[in-house]
Structures are given as structure tokens and as C-alpha cells.
Amino acid sequence: IVLRPSRVHNSEENTMRALTLKDILNGTFSYKTFFPNWISGQEYLHQSADNNIVLYNIETGQSYTILSNRTMKSVNASNYGLSPDRQFVYLESDYSKLWRYSYTATYYIYDLSNGEFVRGNELPRPIQYLCWSPVGSKLAYVYQNNIYLKQRPGDPPFQITFNGRENKIFNGIPDWVYEEEMLATKYALWWSPNGKFLAYAEFNDTDIPVIAYSYYGDEQYPRTINIPYPKAGAKNPVVRIFIIDTTYPAYVGPQEVPVPAMIASSDYYFSWLTWVTDERVCLQWLKRVQNVSVLSICDFREDWQTWDCPKTQEHIEESRTGWAGGFFVSTPVFSYDAISYYKIFSDKDGYKHIHYIKDTVENAIQITSGKWEAINIFRVTQDSLFYSSNEFEEYPGRRNIYRISIGSYPPSKKCVTCHLRKERCQYYTASFSDYAKYYALVCYGPGIPISTLHDGRTDQEIKILEENKELENALKNIQLPKEEIKKLEVDEITLWYKMILPPQFDRSKKYPLLIQVYGGPCSQSVRSVFAVNWISYLASKEGMVIALVDGRGTAFQGDKLLYAVYRKLGVYEVEDQITAVRKFIEMGFIDEKRIAIWGWSYGGYVSSLALASGTGLFKCGIAVAPVSSWEYYASVYTERFMGLPTKDDNLEHYKNSTVMARAEYFRNVDYLLIHGTADDNVHFQNSAQIAKALVNAQVDFQAMWYSDQNHGLSGLSTNHLYTHMTHFLKQCFSLSD
């Protein structure tokens, strides 16, 4: 007997329908957010529905079009950027994606004063990165791995670097591993606040081993994609930071910023650069063994034309229980004295909190405290500090915005968002104008997302920027699943979970259970956000219960939980998913013969290990683009959590934690393995090795590859993927089509 949600017969419910897979694949119920493109304390730009670029002045209430959709269309522009002096706009077209953040594009400069495109000394194409100076209308751009500077848009460029070479030397842009695992940006250059200096990173990948894979395309012979990609333990990129005076760059030339001695003594990373003033810059460095980070404040010495980084301005952050920071080492937010700063790091109780550093880290003043975590510092003004945390009502999966008055003593704290739309909004981010005169709040859920504009002084709501009315109306006749966020207490570990229940859920009935897992270090899956996605459909239409569980290794609940997985990836994450499943079975409404698990990327690794745990709990499962051995993944990410794959370090656990080592245990489960052949991130090699191990063990399994698709499996592949996975699960759970 297959148990399905019972159909309700009252007339109102009759008009309601369940979600369909088509709804999900078509993005029928996607939502919009509104992030103002701030250009001053009280003005912002926004691209209207008809593609005009409109300038809004909050104080006058006026708005006018600064760039018409006709101009945008004339060069097929998909993006724009206004120069700070408001004389020019760059228009971006021919977008061509490279990796997660990087892309190339063609850029045109439009002169707003005469309503014409700038002719003469046009920009080359395609450009890898382009940006205006923070003041005026200087342009810095990266072309063919070299940095160029234009004093004015119509001027000829000045070439700053000359050694750029594809896959060898990267100037002003990161190489693959820095882009994905360290900077999380497409750029590696930073203007000083008034545009006097330009800092940039040079990445030398000459000695890095190359990952090569076939790109099949349409030609007779496939192309080979080559990417310098350091896997765990391999040679890493060599990074150097330079700063050049942008007024007369041809005189002194680029000046290298010295690396702190304690960092330079062995392999290291550059992690971020923060300008403090035009003549003070803050660099963050990290040892290759990522438990020591150094923040170095450097000053420009006019008489020497050098950047001086005194030892007295070096601040060390060290973790004795795990790695430095959360996912990344946090960045400082400097106060108005241009030397003291606010930064999030672990307090003595092992919770990440805001600290104020005036002279040394040892003498840091703790600004926030409690058994919760400060997550992001948005803005520091003369009298206020705005940050987000998950303090409110002790739900780690929420985000509220707080203001601390730093101008008064003792500082007072106010939650700006906690009671605004309490049921609808429990997960916020914010975007501030200059001097935090105004700010936008973007609420992601759990209700339908809404974006609002607020006065930075009074916190008063000024207007709704986007409330997703159309979405709200469209959902009125949809039977959405119910969602609940709760916690399990198991052996002194708190396991937060989100359960997605069929619309007519009945506790007395039995339902198939699907675990959706990610579980990577410093991740969080159990969040109070709105989503209508594939698992919503599975609950709404197919009557499944879906659960997401945040186990050990996940974020924002203190270091004990976060660092539990240090040097032991693949153990506790899996254990905690299994523990949660057992608890769910005890709740009485789960059909224990129909339990599945699925995950993507790190989640694919965890789901594979869970299926191969030998517990007999899972009937089937899916791994999409899984890591299968930590020796195959990127050095920066892997070594942060696992150390080095060497005999005298952690090679043993690298070997013990592979999926291949458990090939035999897949014999009693139905396993669907999926991977894109052009995955630049988690290489197809990972799934190839799983498949080989399963074949060698003579274990039957199902597999699907997506030719020429990367880690995201986008476009038509997405439709095929979710259709294929749906069939697999329905078959596993004996649900009829």
C-alpha cells in the first residue's frame, strides 16, 4: 500500500494544487530582491523593469533616468557602472562565464555629458576585470592577465604589469584556487579610498600541477582544458602584493608590500586587503597550515616611496582547536581613527564575536558575547556599529540586524529587525549607503522575501522596495509543504534540523524520508529562509518528508561543533546524519523501509559515505558531483580542515576517508552517481574513481554524466538532472508516475 496525502474536499481547498516538477524547473515561484546600488548617502541607482538605469534621491523623492534602455540595447549591455564623478558609465556586454565568480566581457564607455560613447582609445576585448577609481573617473582593468590604467576614459592606457601570461602569471585577478577558495571574487586589485594608489596581487602558477580534462564541444576532436589547480599537498601559487601610485605610475613603478617574517618563513597565502586611508593599508596573510593568520597594517613612507609594515602593527590570530576563522578568516572594519578596528573571531568560550582591537589582539575589547555568534559587521560609523547575528530566540539559522551605539558609554544594543515582520522575516541581510544615512533590509524568509528602505538614524521604514506581490498571488492556489525547524539533543550535541512535510501531513501515517545533506565545514543548511524548490515539490506532490540536518562541522553554533571535524572529515558529519535519521524514525511517521539521502558536492561525499556506512538505514541515495578522496580536492580548502596528505601529518585519514575504500558497502543500496565531465571544481576524476572501485568490487550502481557541464550542472542539464533524480527516488520509494 502506498500512502499518499489525503485529498481535502472543501471547496476552497479544491482549487488548490500541488507543486509540479515543471513549476520548479521553470522557476515559476522564484522571488526578487532589491539591493540599491548606492552612489551617495541618499542616492541609489536601480535598473527598472524596462531596463532604464534610474537614479533615486531618497530625500527629495525624485528619480530620473540617467541611462536609457535604448543606449543599453545599442551595445546589448547586461550590466553597467557609473563613475564616481557621474560623468561616465561603463556598459558591459558579451558576458562569458569562466569559473564561479570570473567572467570576461566587452566594455563600452558612455559619456553622460554629451550623450555619446567615448571614441578613440577604446578598451580592448575581452576584458577580465574593470573598475572605476573610487573618486573621479580613472579606470583600472585587466586584459590578458595584465593590469592597465586609464587616467580618463578617452586616454590611452598605461600598462602597469608586463609579465601576465595565461595559466602562468595572473595580475589583478586570482588564479583558480584563490578565486574559489580564498578571495571569493573575480578581482585581485583594490583602489585606495581616494584613488591615489592601486594595490594588486600577482599570482605565479608556474610550478602548479595542471588538471586537464576534455571539453567535447561540437568539433571532430575534443579540446583539452588545462587549469593550474593545486590539489592537497601540491605546489601552491606564489603570491606577491604590489602597490602603484596611480597619478604618476610610470615614475617609481609598482612597490612590493613586504610579507610578515613569521609568515614568509614557510608556505603562505594572502587572504585579503583592506584600505584604511590613502596611505595606510591592511593586509591579511595565512600560513599554509591554516591555524595562524597575521593582520599587517602598512603605511606609505613618502620620503622612501615604500610601504612600511612595522612589527608593532602585526596582529596574530591563532586557533589551537581548529583552523583560523570560520570559512574564511574575517576581515577588519576600521574605525574613524584609522588604526583601531572591529573584527569577528572566537572568544574564550569558543563563540565567534565582535572584538575591538586598539593596540594588540591580546588587549582586544569584546563587543558582543553569548552562546550565539556574530556573523557579519556591515558598517561602522562615528556612533554606531551594525552587525548581524543569530542571537534572537536562540535559533542558529536566523539572521537579524543589530545596532550597537559605540558613541556612548556603556554601548547599547538594539535589534533593528527582530520585531519588524516577525513571522515573515527571520533571516536578513542589509545594504548601507554612505555614512549609513539610509539602508536597505533584504528579508529572505521564512515567509515571502521582502526588501525595505530605512532611515539610518531612526531605523524607521521609509518604503517597500520589493514585496513579491506577484509571487504571493501565484502561491495562493498552491499547496505548499509545511516547514518546521527544531532541534535534537544527542550526547551533548545539538542537532538542528529542518523538516519539510507534505501539505496534509498526518503524524499517524508513514511517509518516505529523503535526507538532503551538504554538511561541509562552516556551512549551514538549516536556515529560516523561503524557498520553493525541488524538495518542496517532492513534499507537496510526491508526499515525501524531507529533512536537512546541521551536524558537527557546521557553522554559527560555536567552535566545539565547528572544529569537531578538524583533521577528520567524513566521520562525524556522516554519523550525525545517521543519528538524526534514527531519531526521525522514533518520531513514528517515517517509513523506515523508504529512506533515502542525497547531496551535491560535499553533500555528495557525505551522502555516499552515509550510504556506505553499513547501517542498513538507507534504501537508496544520490551523489551529485561528489568529492571521493580529499587528495583530489583543492589544497586551500582541503588542507584548512585536513592538514597535509603526508606521512608525518594526516595521510592516514586522507586514505581512510575515501568513498572508494567503502565500495563493498554499496552492495545493499541503490546508488545514483552523477557528475559533469567539465567540472573545474570537483573534478570528474572523483566520480570516475568511485565508479572504478564499484566495478572492481562488482557492485551494481546507476550513473549519469553531463557532458561539458561544470559543477553547477546548469541550463538544460538542470532539467534533465532533476527529472532523472525524481524518477530514481520515485522508483526507490515505489511511488507511481
Epitope: D155, A250, G253, T306
Partner: antibody
Framework: EVQLLESGGGLVQPGGSLRLSCAAS????????MSWVRQAPGKGLEWVSA????????YYADSVKGRFTISRDNSKNTLYLQMNSLRAEDTAVYYC??????????WGQGTLVTVSS | EIVLTQSPGTLSLSPGERATLSCRAS???????LAWYQQKPGQAPRLLIY???IRATGIPDRFSGSGSGTDFTLTISRLEPEDFAVYYC?????????FGQGTKVEIK
């Protein structure tokens, strides 16, 4: 006071080699890019080569590429130009100058290199 | 490479007169990268103007520079006896840096 003092010039046969030196004082030598500029007898100025402050990057005019090598020793505050496979057209007064590509704000007095058989 | 053409080749003037020297580039040069030098016989060149119009340290204010794009000018408002020399313009906007062929300012 900034001072640049070239040395090492002289008479050399075609195909021969010569090493020019430029001793710098009066400024933080390691901070500045430096250049060599030459002037053939009765002719104009021609940029020859440049080197970054750290010595990590070097630049050459096409006319000398592959034959001349610019280097520096920051501990000795000295700039060098190693000239190999010299030709008659390399005959010139060689100046060392403070600066990368422009401006050259200080110049040495120059050293004469004569390439002749 | 960018070719700089200076005119006139020679300028014959008397002390106290105004001298106007021209420098034309074969392609556009951003003014930040244009310099002027003075060279006297048997001496090294001396920087006069950088950034097309900014006087170097110790240069008298009778020397001024102007221009943009492809046309640049060095003006000596009132020639002093010590100003009779060869003047070179130079660009560093593009590698290789190049010099004009020089303008000789001689006593009439």
C-alpha cells in the same frame, strides 16, 4: 642630495662585452625603478632598459633585447648594465637615470662606450 | 612604438624673448606620461616638466608645459642666457619610452 655615478665605459671591439655600473646615493635606492638611457654622438636620447625597485622585473628596448642585461644590487645601491655582442651602433654615452618609464628626475653624468675595431 | 616629432628643429631667439616648442605624438599620450628635459653640451639631461604641465623641483616658473592627446607644448616665457640648450620631450605612456629628436634653442 641625489647622486648617480656611472662607470665602466671604454673602448671595446664589435662582439665584445662591457659591464656598466651606476652608484646611487641620496635616496632609498631599493624603492625606485631605474633606467639606462643612451645618446649616440651628436644624436638624441634613446631609452635602453629599466628595472623595478626589487629587481624582479626588467624591460628592454628591442634594439638591445637578448644582448643587454640590466640588474641591481640593492645592498650596494648599485645599478648594472651587462652589454654583450656589442655593435658599432651601440656607441654612445650611457646615462643611468632614476625612474621607470617617465619622468627621469635624476641623471648621472654618463659614461662613454665606444665600439670599434 | 610612439614616435615624438619636435618642431622646430632649431629655434633662434634673443634673451628675453618667448620660446614655444612643439612636440607631436604619433598616437595619443595621456598627459600624466609626458615630460620635457633640457640638455646643455657635455652635460646630462635635466628634468624640467613632468605630467605635461608640472614643473620639477627647482625649475623656474618661466618654464611651462601644456597640451594633451597628441600635441604638447613647452613654453619659456622670457629666455635667460642659461636657457639656450637642446630640449627633448619624452613619453612613458607606452613601452618603449621614447624621446623626441630634440629642439635646439640658440641665441639669435
Amino acid at each position: 642630495e641625489v647622486q648617480l655615478l656611472e662607470s665602466g665605459g671604454g673602448l671595446v671591439q664589435p662582439g665584445g662585452s662591457l659591464r656598466l655600473s651606476c652608484a646611487a646615493s641620496g635616496f632609498t635606492f631599493s624603492s625606485y625603478a631605474m633606467s639606462w638611457v643612451r645618446q649616440a654622438p651628436g644624436k638624441g636620447l634613446e631609452w635602453v632598459s629599466a628595472i623595478s625597485g626589487s629587481g624582479g622585473s626588467t624591460y628592454y628596448a628591442d634594439s638591445v633585447k637578448g644582448r643587454f642585461t640590466i640588474s641591481r644590487d640593492n645592498s650596494k645601491n648599485t645599478l648594472y648594465l651587462q652589454m654583450n655582442s656589442l655593435r658599432a651602433e651601440d656607441t654612445a654615452v650611457y646615462y643611468c637615470a632614476k625612474g621607470w618609464f617617465t619622468p627621469f628626475d635624476y641623471w648621472g653624468q654618463g659614461t662613454l662606450v665606444t665600439v670599434s675595431s | 612604438e610612439i614616435v615624438l616629432t619636435q618642431s622646430p628643429g632649431t629655434l633662434s631667439l634673443s634673451p628675453g624673448e618667448r620660446a614655444t616648442l612643439s612636440c607631436r605624438a604619433s598616437q595619443s599620450v595621456s598627459s600624466n606620461y609626458l615630460a620635457w628635459y633640457q640638455q646643455k653640451p657635455g652635460q646630462a639631461p635635466r628634468l624640467l616638466i613632468y605630467g605635461a604641465s608640472i614643473r620639477a623641483t627647482g625649475i623656474p616658473d618661466r618654464f611651462s608645459g601644456s597640451g594633451s592627446g597628441t600635441d604638447f607644448t613647452l613654453t619659456i616665457s622670457r629666455l635667460e642666457p642659461e636657457d639656450f640648450a637642446v630640449y627633448y620631450c619624452q613619453q612613458g605612456n607606452q613601452i618603449p619610452p621614447t624621446f623626441g629628436q630634440g629642439t635646439k634653442v640658440e641665441i639669435k
